[in-house]
């Protein structure tokens, strides 16, 4: 591997270690699980295509108005620290994957059945945008082996 | 010095199947997303099929989509795009491109090319 | 999908010139613009990326700006063999898109 590769590799590792990335973790699951309650049920049913166009955060506007302004002061509060962490990371977006990875990696077991899980990822994946940040465009958040079809 | 050499490609008629290779050399290639971009007199350059590094998370173009597959084999160093329901429009040269290792958005090498005609 | 509209289509130059290309993205992309040079029959090849980020053995007359939605590339002095086409590319989200490319050709 050239060296500057392995030179990134090392920073990101420390990057990772100084970062802490529990109000990120906190703001996703307040996100996903009052999403369904507030539709009484998983938003996401087997009936729609968790790929389709419309549900597809590389589709959305990144500057449309941000679905969590309206939420409540907890995770608003939770989203702010979560984007002052992420945003360490603005510079180098392999590492930002990789602190997407482990927020995901630390995550899996709480998240209910391929439903849920599908749905923390999308809500991941749009996390950086939502902090005015680029999203990692070729970023692995599979926790076991298989992919999903992106774009 | 990178390397990235493209097969496969032929006249096939509208509905038929193609598979593109692309063999990598020169680099890590496992450490690698991947794309196949394509270049049509009429369209210009137009972005194909893309695949993560460790080939988990693949991308594809609206206008491919259901119908191409991309795939590797980092053991082989290895890119495939299998293209099939061909219509007359996939017809273009179709090029192998390396990203670049951090995710920037760019396409540092790019193979030469292999030309697709999909015609009756 | 974000568009990406370059200008001027064509431009007829003389060697010694000065050229500037221009680009423009239909939403803001930061600085993740890139330009490639293509020679007839031959692969496209990054000659900047970033927005300004010379590629390593790019010759130091050619140079990029801009941030946001406008990006320029500009060629200080022209030589034979900078005659080719040159697009611009964003690689801000998925998926990644193309200026339709800027023929630079002999006056």
């Known amino acids: 591997r050239q060296q500057w590769e392995l030179q990134g590799d090392r920073r990101c590792q420390s990057q990772l270690e100084r970062a802490n990335l529990r109000p990120c973790e906190q703001h996703l699951m307040q996100k996903i699980q009052r999403d369904e309650d507030s539709y009484g049920r998983d938003p996401y049913s087997p009936s729609q295509d968790p790929y389709s166009p419309s549900q597809d955060p590389d589709r959305r506007d990144p500057y449309s108005p941000s679905p969590y302004d309206r939420r409540g002061a907890g995770s608003s509060q939770h989203q702010e620290r979560c984007c002052n962490e992420l945003n360490e990371f603005e510079n180098n977006q392999r590492c930002m994957c990789e602190a997407l990875q482990q927020i995901m990696e630390n995550q899996s077991d709480r998240l209910q059945g391929r439903q849920q899980e599908q749905q923390f990822k999308r809500e991941l994946r749009n996390l950086p945008q939502q902090c005015g940040l680029r999203a990692p465009q070729r970023c692995d958040l599979e926790v076991e082996s298989g992919g999903r079809d992106r774009y | 010095e990178v390397q990235l050499l493209e097969s496969g490609g032929g006249l096939v008629q509208p509905g038929g199947s193609l598979r593109l290779s692309c063999a990598a050399s020169g680099f890590t290639f496992s450490n690698h997303a991947m794309s196949w971009v394509r270049q049509t007199p009429g369209e210009g350059l137009q972005w194909v099929s893309a695949?993560?590094?460790?080939?988990?998370?693949?991308y594809y173009a609206d206008s491919v989509k259901g119908r191409f597959t991309i795939s590797r084999d980092n053991s082989k160093n290895l890119l495939f795009l299998q293209m099939n329901s061909l219509r007359a429009g996939d017809t273009a040269i179709y090029y192998c491109?390396?990203?670049?290792?951090?995710?920037?958005?760019?396409?540092?090498?790019w193979g030469q090319g292999t030309r697709v005609t999909v015609s009756s | 999908d974000i568009q990406m509209t370059q200008s001027p289509s064509s431009l007829s130059a003389s060697v010694g010139d000065r050229v500037t290309i221009t680009c423009r993205a239909s939403q803001t992309i930061s600085t993740y613009l890139h330009w490639y040079q293509q020679k007839p029959g031959k692969a496209p090849n990054l000659l900047i990326y970033a927005a300004s980020t010379l590629q390593s053995g790019v010759p130091s007359r050619f140079s990029g700006s801009g941030s946001g939605t406008d990006f320029s590339l500009t060629i200080s002095s022209l030589r034979p063999e900078d005659f080719a086409i040159y697009y611009c590319q964003q690689g801000y989200n998925n998926p990644y898109t193309f200026g339709q490319g800027t023929k630079v050709d002999i006056k």
């Open positions: 695949l993560t590094y460790s080939g988990k998370t693949t």
């Open positions: 491109a390396k990203e670049d290792y951090d995710d920037r958005g760019f396409f540092d090498f």
